[in-house]
Interface confidence: medium
């Protein structure tokens, strides 16, 4: 079952999944100037059996200027460098969730992939939060969120993490407090977590993969 809302936003924090539950989709997105090959997959899908999980489908990008040439999937070093790093910077890493049964590891990059990865999570997925550079964590509890099913609706649990500017606790003179993120959620929206969207995806994920809920084709 797909999680039909997004993990909660913590001001001045990012989140990262350490592994992805079976059923997770990852968009096959290409960087500017490139597009998916005509017959290529829209997404990769984490699938598996009781002993092994892996990503089905391969993402392939081709130059928007060319028609029939496909690019090899193995990324070149310079292209790997070009991708934004999505790894958490903290030395404090959670337990390697990728070793859990029913989970896929982070897929390797593909050539000319977009700079940001777009995942569609499923119930049971856990994501971990970390404060961005310039902010420090004040923990009241676990800095993680789990997508849960309650009374037929999905919701993400609230991570117990506050990210505070280092200036607020530091004694160093001349230190500037980092500017507040312009992307923070307005206060009126902080109680949205248990609210799910009106257009919930009720059907099984396998049955909805190629439907108009997710996909619109070029005319």
């Amino acid at each position: 079952e797909l999680c039909d809302d997004d993990p909660p936003e913590i001001p001045h924090a990012t989140f990262k999944a350490m592994a992805y539950k079976e059923g997770t989709m990852l968009n096959c997105e290409c960087k500017r100037g490139f597009r998916r090959i005509k017959s290529g997959s829209l997404y990769m899908l984490c699938t598996g059996n009781s002993s092994h999980s892996s990503w089905d489908n391969q993402c392939q990008c081709t130059s928007s200027a060319t028609r029939n040439t496909t690019k090899q999937v193995t990324p070149q070093p310079e292209e790997q460098k070009e991708r934004k790093t999505t790894e958490m910077q903290s030395p404090m890493q959670p337990v390697d969730q990728a070793s859990l049964p029913g989970h896929c590891r982070e897929p390797p990059p593909w050539e000319n992939e977009a700079t940001e990865r777009i995942y569609h999570f499923v119930v049971g997925q856990m994501v971990y939060y970390q404060c961005v550079q310039g902010y420090r964590a004040l923990h009241r509890g676990p800095a993680e969120s789990v997508c849960k099913m309650t009374h037929g609706k999905t919701r993400w649990t609230q991570p117990q993490l506050i990210c505070t500017g280092e200036m607020e606790t530091s004694q160093f003179p001349g230190e500037e407090k980092p500017q507040a993120s312009p992307e923070g959620r307005p206060e009126s929206e902080t109680s949205c977590l248990v609210t799910t969207t009106d257009f919930q995806i009720q059907t099984e994920m396998a049955a909805t993969m190629e439907t108009s809920i997710f996909t619109t084709e070029y005319q």
Partner: nanobody, 130 residues
Framework: EVQLVESGGGSVQAGGSLRLSCAAS?????????MAWFRQAPGKERDFVGS????????SYADSVKDRFTISRDNAKSTVYLQMNNTKPEDTAVYYC??????????????????????WGQGTQVTVSS
Amino acid sequence: EVQLVESGGGSVQAGGSLRLSCAASGRTLYSSYGMAWFRQAPGKERDFVGSISRYGTYTSYADSVKDRFTISRDNAKSTVYLQMNNTKPEDTAVYYCAAYTYSGSFYSTVKTHRDEYQYWGQGTQVTVSS
């Protein structure tokens, strides 16, 4: 990539209502995109009106339209809507639909700056007369 086409613009009396639609097309996963409405009055900057996260969980509005405008989306129809109630003459503008790519690792529920939106529609004119 996603292509956006607005519709529903027109003329309305002050205090009246109008509903704008923005249909998305393209070989893409529509629920990958956060959506927004902006507007541009003659001789002015293009201003943020409201935005909605990819599953409609989170919304944000400009102060000038709060409690009057409502943004919603229907992922099954690949469409985002702007319901304009209690319109005012100062709402007169070209209204643009915009989309940004959601990112699972570097995440923000709502974006309010036009530079953060990669995809734009052509706009639809709304005229509110007194």
